[in-house]
Interface confidence: low
């Protein structure tokens, strides 16, 4: 046969086939602990391979940590009636390697989602938006925690991991209401340039413990609500004028830059001048040079223009090996 078009609209209600019968309001799934008073269900470290189908309708906080879920399919939490109260969902450390499109659909109150410490070889572009429309219905998510979701090297495939995560964050512009985004410890070499433009409500952004070398193509300009920007433990060598101006222009921001291998040569002059006058950088007195060797461990705030020189570039005929 010939290939069919794959365009299709999202279902107005995606029921879990396994839960056609409404769950009893007070039942607790096997291998879980439930507290109706606290509106909390904990199914922790039980080696579950699937999301329990019989979750109680009162659940507001659901912990499914330390399991072996492997795959979250579309409608993994869709129930009839829906889990309308579920506000916080923690799936960290559950050996997820695939999150499919629409995995979190039909959770109308879901404000916090933690997928940390899962080796996500595959994150659907529509994991959070639930549909492949260019503009999706807004997601209710306010906090999205994606720390250490990078898969091991042998499972990273050929696609850019940064690009895969970015696609999920921007799809359908569904995450415009997101306030907190944690992307620490993901071996990011770069931040795709369009991501932050699609997340205008961000107040807290954690990119610490990655491998970011440069922020040259990243724009912070429209993050006017940003309060905390964590860039500690990356591979940043210098922040250039454009980035400095954008950060200075954000009214509430505090930036954390510790433990980056700052290169203290002539390209660092603008950043040093800015550091001396800005109140934006927290702990700026702790920032030290890593290179060149003669500048190692020098405090950036104590440098002056005479310290920041670049070795002259020799003409090719005078260069030696």
């Amino acid at each position: 046969t010939s290939s069919a078009s794959s365009s299709s609209s999202s279902a107005p209600f995606l029921a879990s086939a396994a839960s056609a019968q409404p769950p009893l309001p007070d039942q607790c799934p096997a291998l879980c602990e439930c507290s109706e008073a606290a509106r909390t269900v904990k199914c922790v470290n039980r080696n579950l391979t699937e999301v329990p189908t019989d979750l109680p309708l009162y659940v507001r906080n659901l912990f499914l940590t330390g399991n072996q879920l492997a795959v979250l399919p579309a409608g993994a939490f869709a129930r009839r009636p829906p889990l309308a109260e579920l506000a916080a969902l923690n799936l960290s450390g559950s050996r997820l390697d695939e999150v499919r499109g629409g995995a979190f659909e039909h959770l109308p109150s879901l404000r916090q989602l933690d997928l940390s410490h899962n080796p996500l070889a595959y994150l659907s572009p529509f994991a959070f938006s639930g549909s492949n429309a260019s503009i999706s219905a807004p997601s209710p998510l306010v906090e999205l925690i994606l720390n250490h979701i990078v898969p091991p090297d042998d499972k990273r495939q050929n696609r850019s991991f940064e690009g895969m995560v970015a696609a999920a964050l921007v799809a359908g512009r569904a995450l415009q209401g997101l306030h907190l985004l944690e992307l620490a410890s993901n071996h990011f070499l770069y931040l795709p340039r369009d991501v932050l433009a699609q997340l205008p409500s961000l107040r807290y952004l954690d990119l610490s413990n990655n491998s970011l070398v440069s922020l040259t193509y990243v724009s912070f300009r429209n993050l006017t609500h940003l309060e905390s920007l964590h860039l500690e433990d990356n591979a940043l060598k210098v922040l250039h004028n454009g980035t400095l101006a954008e950060l200075q222009g954000l009214p509430h921001v505090r930036v954390f830059l510790d433990n980056n291998p700052w290169v203290c040569d002539c390209h660092m002059a603008d950043m040093v001048t800015w550091l001396k006058q800005t109140g934006v950088v927290q702990g700026k007195d702790r920032l030290t040079c890593a290179f060149p060797e003669k500048m190692r461990n020098r405090v950036l705030l104590e440098l002056n223009s005479a310290d920041l020189d670049c070795d002259p570039i020799l003409p090719p005929s005078l260069q030696t090996s």
């Epitope: 999202s10 279902a11 579309a74 390697d97 695939e98 499919r100 070889a121 595959y122």
Partner: antibody, heavy 123, light 107 residues
Framework: EVQLQQSGPELVKPGASVKISCKAS????????MNWVKQSHGKSLEWIGD????????TNNQKFKGKATLTVDKSSSTAYIELRSLTSEDSAVYFC????????????????WGQGTTLTVSS | DIQMTQSPASLSASVGETVTITCRAS??????LAWYQQKQGKSPQLLVY???SLTEGVPSRFSGSRSGTQFSLKINSLQPEDFGSYYC?????????FGGGTKLEIK
């Protein structure tokens, strides 16, 4: 041209295992879910499960949990189904079928099918 | 699991006639239904998806429709190559399930 080429017929003894292959060509293998469907003689079709070739993540029909294991080899664009602890009930034709593209969670119909592999379980 | 009940189980018709096969879902599956044709000893072929979208290359004498949880496949002016078995399948939520099939025979 999209093609799914399955391995040949199998005659196996009860209690044994068998692994059937499905080699895909004519499209980007890692962009589409691969499904496996069972058809017992003269009967209807049963969906066994699907696998995302990009990640290797599989979803099985509960009925086939413990019976079928789905895997892929991306380097050869080949999907596999391994059936274990075989009984006469497992005698059937097994089809691989291409499912939805990776970003569309609703297009779970099967637009291309392999030619089918006949499995006979007999002592 | 969602059950798909297909009727009739078998049907005899002549070339040129119009026939309708129906499929009922045990619960609301919206428009997430596909129809397949299968000839003896061959693989199924996709005819219709999303209840009424015709697969490229399928003749326009085939059409699909939906009314609530009941779905129909209509074949106008039957041709000799249309005889075989037909199956419906929902593509709403796992596990995807098929109807029991309708065998369309030549009268």
């Amino acid at each position: 041209e999209v093609q799914l080429q399955q391995s040949g017929p199998e005659l196996v003894k009860p209690g044994a295992s068998v692994k059937i292959s499905c080699k895909a060509s004519g499209y980007t293998f890692t962009d589409y879910y691969m499904n496996w469907v069972k058809q017992s003689h003269g009967k209807s079709l049963e969906w066994i499960g699907d696998i995302n070739p990009y990640s290797g993540g599989a979803t099985n029909n509960q009925k086939f949990k413990g019976k079928a294991t789905l895997t892929v080899d991306k380097s050869s664009s080949t999907a596999y189904i391994e059936l274990r602890s075989l009984t006469s009930e497992d005698s059937a034709v097994y089809f691989c079928a291409r499912g939805s593209i990776y970003y569309d969670s609703t297009a779970n119909y099967f637009d291309y099918w392999g030619q089918g592999t006949t499995l006979t379980v007999s002592s | 699991d969602i059950q798909m009940t297909q009727s009739p189980a078998s049907l005899s018709a002549s070339v040129g006639e119009t026939v309708t096969i129906t499929c009922r879902a045990s619960e609301n599956i919206y428009s997430y239904l596909a129809w397949y044709q299968q000839k003896q000893g061959k693989s199924p072929q996709l005819l219709v998806y999303n209840a009424k979208s015709l697969t490229e290359g399928v003749p326009s004498r085939f059409s699909g429709s939906r009314s609530g949880t009941q779905f129909s496949l209509k074949i106008n002016s039957l041709q000799p190559e249309d005889f075989g078995s037909y199956y419906c399948q929902h593509h709403y939520v796992t596990p995807w399930t098929f109807g029991g099939g309708t065998k369309l025979e030549i009268k």
